[in-house]
Interface confidence: low
């Protein structure tokens, strides 16, 4: 028997520095977690203690904090090289700055293979990207070899900016021939490493003949055997065992997100490459694990540029940006409109001639807007200003909801109106009229939404049975502020870009902004 230790991360999203327990900015260092310096300590400790170790990343290193905003992926290549990752799969967010923003900072600089079998390049891009990412890689580990095949969510064109010269194929269809080739090469230990979410990970384990282990990402799935060490609730045991169609037991793993945990899986193979046993658990990277001093020093050196950046002007406002709770928790506020407009702008993807865009709607809890911005400071808007407005380090995500769920969400928005509560929704691509004289749960009297399958966008009444795409904060997608119906009834959820980054990019693009209060949210009384 031969034993392999797989260490794995996924959806790190730019958390190079240690974070608080909820993966936001570290405030009290003694209670902070994760970060590459602490990760390196644990990885090195395991490498010294065990003979056959692979360190793998299942994608979405890009996007999530000011580190990515400033360094644009160079930080990912630098620190992943320093940690000596063995392989990485491409995630959807690796395309956030277009293909160029992937090629130059990461693909050309990484000293480890970057993988995806289901992304095929065409046209002029094909030669430019040639050999920079691979469908699979065979890695020598001790005196054996292990094949790693990569995969990426085929929804990437809707979630990021891969352009028109990359084709995202069905994961299973693309993986099978690559695994077949590895088998022909006498590679009998094969790991599928990829970024399509837990449901697809399980399907790959079930359907792709020859895959021994699946290491996934995208859905931020937390798996754990026994009592979990922090706040995350396990979606199942670690590893999650899938019985393949050909009768094998295939372990599937994921390690939550944000570098909070290091996935740790031990696999025992027989001489024919069959998995005999698999066990492990994610390791919580808490303050009991010291930060490696050399990596920490390097982090501090890279940090200097970030502090300078946060005070630079992004753009100007010529109007007061009303982000006060007195406005945003009671009525339409222009800060809410600005943020929603930025959210939609960030999701412009012309992937189908029938649609002007794939999504037109935005909702945003008023309680998530934490500060106004005064235009009387020469109109200057900085990252620092935006960090006061959006201090929670969230993301603006894409969900699919039925009209009936949206209607419930808007009823919840005003179910206890007048108490300055955070659930009052700011909107984009939506016209809502409330009648507060009616009883809670029956106060939405008009709800019109902007069409997407149209050449001239116009507002049409919400249809209860239709499925709509909506951009919203991850806080709402996870049922925050009492929006349990969104969490329970959403049909799809893809995590998006860092909230501040979305707004800062929009302001930089527009240069001068002047958002108005324009009748997106109205109140009426009486008969309708």
């Amino acid at each position: 028997a031969w034993e392999l230790t797989i260490l794995h991360t996924n959806d790190v999203h730019s958390r190079l520095e240690q974070t608080s327990e909820d993966s936001s900015k570290c405030v009290n260092a003694s209670r902070c977690m994760g970060g590459v310096a602490r990760l390196f300590t644990k990885v090195q400790q395991i490498r010294r203690a065990e003979p056959n170790v692979l360190l793998l990343d299942a994608g979405d290193q890009y996007q999530g904090t000011i580190w990515f905003t400033v360094y644009k992926g160079a930080e990912v290549a630098h620190f992943m090289n320093a940690l000596r990752y063995d392989a990485m799969a491409l995630g959807n967010h690796e395309f956030d700055n277009g293909v160029e923003g992937l090629i130059e900072p990461l693909l050309k600089e990484a000293k480890f293979p970057i993988l995806s079998a289901n992304i095929k390049a065409k046209g002029p891009l094909a030669s430019q990207i040639s050999g920079l990412y691979l469908p699979y890689k065979v890695l020598p580990v001790g005196d054996e070899v292990v094949g790693i095949v990569g995969y990426t969510s085929k929804e990437t064109p809707f979630l990021s900016n891969p352009g028109t010269n990359l084709v995202f194929e069905d994961e299973i269809t693309a993986l099978q021939p690559e695994v077949d080739k590895l088998k022909t090469l006498n590679v009998n230990k094969i790991i599928a490493l990829g970024h399509s979410g837990f449901e697809m990970d399980k399907l790959i384990a079930q359907k792709v003949r020859g895959v021994d282990v699946v290491v996934g990402g995208h859905s931020n799935t937390f798996l754990y055997t026994g009592n979990p060490p922090s706040k995350e609730v396990p979606a199942g045991k670690y590893p999650f065992i899938v019985t393949s169609d050909d009768g094998r037991k295939v372990p599937v793993v994921q390690a939550y997100a944000f570098g909070k945990y290091l996935g740790y899986l031990k696999i025992e193979f027989d001489e024919r490459g069959n998995v005999i046993s698999s066990h492990g658990n994610p390791i919580l990277l808490n303050s009991s694990i010291p930060e490696d001093p050399s990596i920490k020093a390097d982090i501090n050196k890279w940090r200097i540029k970030l502090d300078n950046y946060s005070t630079q002007e992004l753009g100007k406002t010529i109007v007061y940006l009303d982000g006060s709770s007195q406005s945003c928790r009671f009525r339409e506020c222009n800060m809410g409109n600005l943020i929603c407009d930025a959210m939609i702008n960030n999701n412009l993807r012309h992937t189908d001639e029938m649609f002007w865009n794939h999504v037109s709607m935005c909702i945003l809890n008023g309680g998530g807007i934490r500060s106004p911005i005064d235009e009387r400071n020469n109109g200057t808007i900085t990252w620092e200003n935006l960090a006061a407005v959006l201090p929670f380090g969230g993301t603006f995500d894409l969900v699919q909801l039925k009209g009936s769920t949206l209607k419930k969400a808007f009823e919840h928005s005003v179910h206890r109106y007048g108490q300055s509560t955070g659930e009052f929704l700011q909107v984009g691509g939506i016209h809502v009229v409330y009648d507060l004289s009616r009883k809670p749960g029956d106060r939405v009297v008009k709800l019109d939404v902007l069409c997407t399958k149209c050449r001239v966008p116009s507002y049409d009444p919400l249809k209860m049975d239709e499925v709509y795409k909506v951009i919203l904060p991850n806080f709402l997608a996870n049922g925050g502020d009492g929006f349990q119906m969104i969490k329970d009834e959403l049909l799809r959820h893809d995590s998006g870009d860092q909230d501040i980054n979305v707004v800062s990019t929009y302001i930089s693009k527009m240069k001068v902004i002047y958002p108005a209060v324009e009748g997106r949210i109205k109140f009426s009384t009486g008969s309708h």
């Epitope: 050999g131 021939p177 077949d180 080739k181």
Partner: antibody
Framework: QVQLVQSGAEVKKSGSSVKVSCKAS????????ISWVRQAPGQGLEWMGM????????NYAQKFQGRVTITADESTSIAYMELSSLRSEDTAVYYC??????????????WGQGTMVTVSS | QAVLTQPSSVSGAPGQRVTISCTGT?????????IHWYQQLPGTAPKLLMY???RRPSGVPDRFSGSKSGTSASLTITGLQVEDEADYYC???????????FGGGTKLTVL
Amino acid sequence: QVQLVQSGAEVKKSGSSVKVSCKASGGTFSSYAISWVRQAPGQGLEWMGMIIPIFGTANYAQKFQGRVTITADESTSIAYMELSSLRSEDTAVYYCASDGAVAAYDAFLIWGQGTMVTVSS
Amino acid sequence: QAVLTQPSSVSGAPGQRVTISCTGTSSNIGAGFDIHWYQQLPGTAPKLLMYRFSRRPSGVPDRFSGSKSGTSASLTITGLQVEDEADYYCQSYDSGQRGWVFGGGTKLTVL
């Protein structure tokens, strides 16, 4: 960039064996996939088999199974192809070819200059 | 008999566009295995021209392009030049044969 240099031309009698060598330089030989491809005069290309030195074992095309042996010596960075029970239709140019690094692509990026093997009766 | 089928010859005048087809089956191209193309000038070893359907190794001009549809692939040369006169081969992996297979080759003549 790896280079492949093959041994010289051979004239062999029908029923005998031939062993052609392919020396790699300028890279990590053990992790390359080395294939052998032959081309009879005026004919197309035919894949015979491949070896990845780090794996040790070779793979062979069904047509040549039992008649061809592909080996590799990591210490000298040389791959060998031995074909036995030669017949006149084995007269061909024999090429070694590599993908340049295992699993980068299964295309043959680097080729040797070819070794002419003539089988006479 | 080659597993992948190519026309035995094609021709074109300088500056023209020519396409060489490569037809396979559900056990090679149709199964999703990559197609690679080689150029062989008279008396020399083959040279990789295009891999994974449409990627060019460095040094290959962008006049050469590749595509795939179903169980077939094709190599297109635009702006034909005299030095393009050569034999062209397609190659893929075949799951039935558990090995790499070539087309029979296409002789391109530049008129």
